[in-house]
């Protein structure tokens, strides 16, 4: 059993190294920014509109292209739920330092959890996506 798990871990590791998760990251960031733009305001301060909608984000064409490429990548993890979870964790880790607000972080996590389902894949049952709040700047 241990031997099997070790092989599974190795296989997952090499799958993760081969995978290009950037389209997923691009799709998710565009999605949460588009949602915020469409509300047109920071929900926490009703008197202040932090952003005005961007024509690029409003179009959404780039995002659906990213989603398609993202789903193709995630498809590789379909038969390994634990590895799928690790892929989602890696996406969260890669973007955590871009999210400097609690609301943005929670929304990103929500969309990330829904990602496998959006791709018509099984979502991992238990997958901890917690990172240090506010992310870390990585160089």
């Amino acid at each position: 059993r241990q031997q099997w798990e070790l092989q599974g871990d190795r296989r997952c590791q090499s799958q993760l190294e081969r995978a290009n998760l950037r389209p997923c990251e691009q799709h998710l960031m565009q999605k949460i920014q588009r949602d915020e733009d469409s509300y047109g305001r920071d929900p926490y301060s009703p008197s202040q509109d932090p952003y005005s909608p961007s024509p690029y984000d409003r179009r959404g064409a780039g995002s659906s292209q990213h989603q398609e490429r993202c789903c193709n990548e995630l498809n590789e993890f379909e038969n390994n739920q634990r590895c799928m979870c690790e892929a989602l964790q890696q996406i969260m880790e890669n973007q955590s330092d871009r999210l400097q607000g609690r609301q943005q972080e929670q929304q990103f996590k929500r969309e990330l959890r829904n990602l496998p389902q959006q791709c018509g894949l099984r979502a991992p049952q238990r997958c901890d996506l917690e990172v240090e709040s506010g992310g870390r700047d990585r160089y």
């Epitope: 202040q48 890669n94 240090e132």
Partner: antibody, heavy 118, light 111 residues
Framework: QVQLVESGGGVVQPGRSLRLSCAAS????????MHWVRRSPDKGLEWVAA????????YYADSVKGRFTISRDSSKNTLFLQMDSLRVEDTAVYYC???????????WGQGTLVTVSS | DIVMTQSPLSLPVTPGEPASISCRSS???????????LDWYLQKPGQSPQLLIY???KRASGVPDRFSGSGSGTDFTLKISRVEAEDVGVYYC????????FGQGTKVEIK
């Protein structure tokens, strides 16, 4: 409406310390990264430090690393900047600013002047 | 560290005429998520800085549409299609890819 009010500035001698405060109201203070930025006549705007909403992560400009400490008190909606070993080149107007959530500096205070002079 | 370089440092303008400011970074500001982490700020005389443009080309709310941002990678431009008297002040670009760094500023004044 959104208000960020800095205080604690003043005239201080080189090598001494000063503690700046920034009181926030009308914003979700505890849900965003907060920053300190300074403006001096010779250098323009210079980002100084930032602290994540949970207070776990702190970031500093190289010019202040090891001398300045950023912190926040969530219960009082207040941001702090402890400035030790002050130098003449730290003379500036210090602003606190709230992050947009995507690394832009969205809301700014009116600033407090710090003068380091012998 | 990323170094931000603005030009020109001083820009005399005529109301009604266009104006543009250039900003160059010492390394690409494109994150793996596809966004350029470059903002533009304006500090009017006697006021605190204000956000004009974020992520290279998105206009912050309340900012007149005569302001536009463009560019990608290491080269960015802020354009004012028709300068108005109230646009005077110091304009700064700022990178937010690795921590945060401002350019030296461009002082815009009426001729």
């Amino acid at each position: 409406q959104v208000q960020l009010v800095e205080s604690g500035g003043g005239v201080v001698q080189p090598g001494r310390s000063l503690r700046l405060s920034c009181a926030a109201s009308g914003i979700a203070f505890n849900d965003y990264t907060m920053h300190w930025v300074r403006r001096s006549p010779d250098k323009g705007l210079e980002w100084v430090a930032a602290i994540s909403y949970g207070g776990t992560n702190k970031y500093y400009a190289d010019s202040v690393k090891g001398r300045f400490t950023i912190s926040r008190d969530s219960s009082k909606n207040t941001l702090f900047l402890q400035m030790d070993s002050l130098r003449v080149e730290d003379t500036a107007v210090y602003y606190c600013a709230r992050d947009s959530g995507y690394r832009s500096l969205l809301h700014w205070g009116q600033g407090t002047l710090v003068t380091v002079s012998s | 560290d990323i170094v931000m370089t603005q030009s020109p440092l001083s820009l005399p303008v005529t109301p009604g005429e266009p104006a543009s400011i250039s900003c160059r970074s010492s390394q690409s500001l494109v994150h793996r998520n596809g966004y350029n982490y470059l903002d533009w700020y304006l500090q009017k005389p006697g006021q605190s800085p204000q956000l004009l443009i974020y992520m290279a080309s998105k206009r912050a709310s309340g900012v007149p549409d005569r302001f536009s941002g463009s560019g990608s990678g290491t080269d960015f431009t802020l354009k004012i299609s028709r300068v108005e008297a109230e646009d005077v002040g110091v304009y700064y670009c700022m990178q937010a890819l690795q921590t945060w760094t401002f350019g030296q500023g461009t002082k815009v004044e009426i001729k």
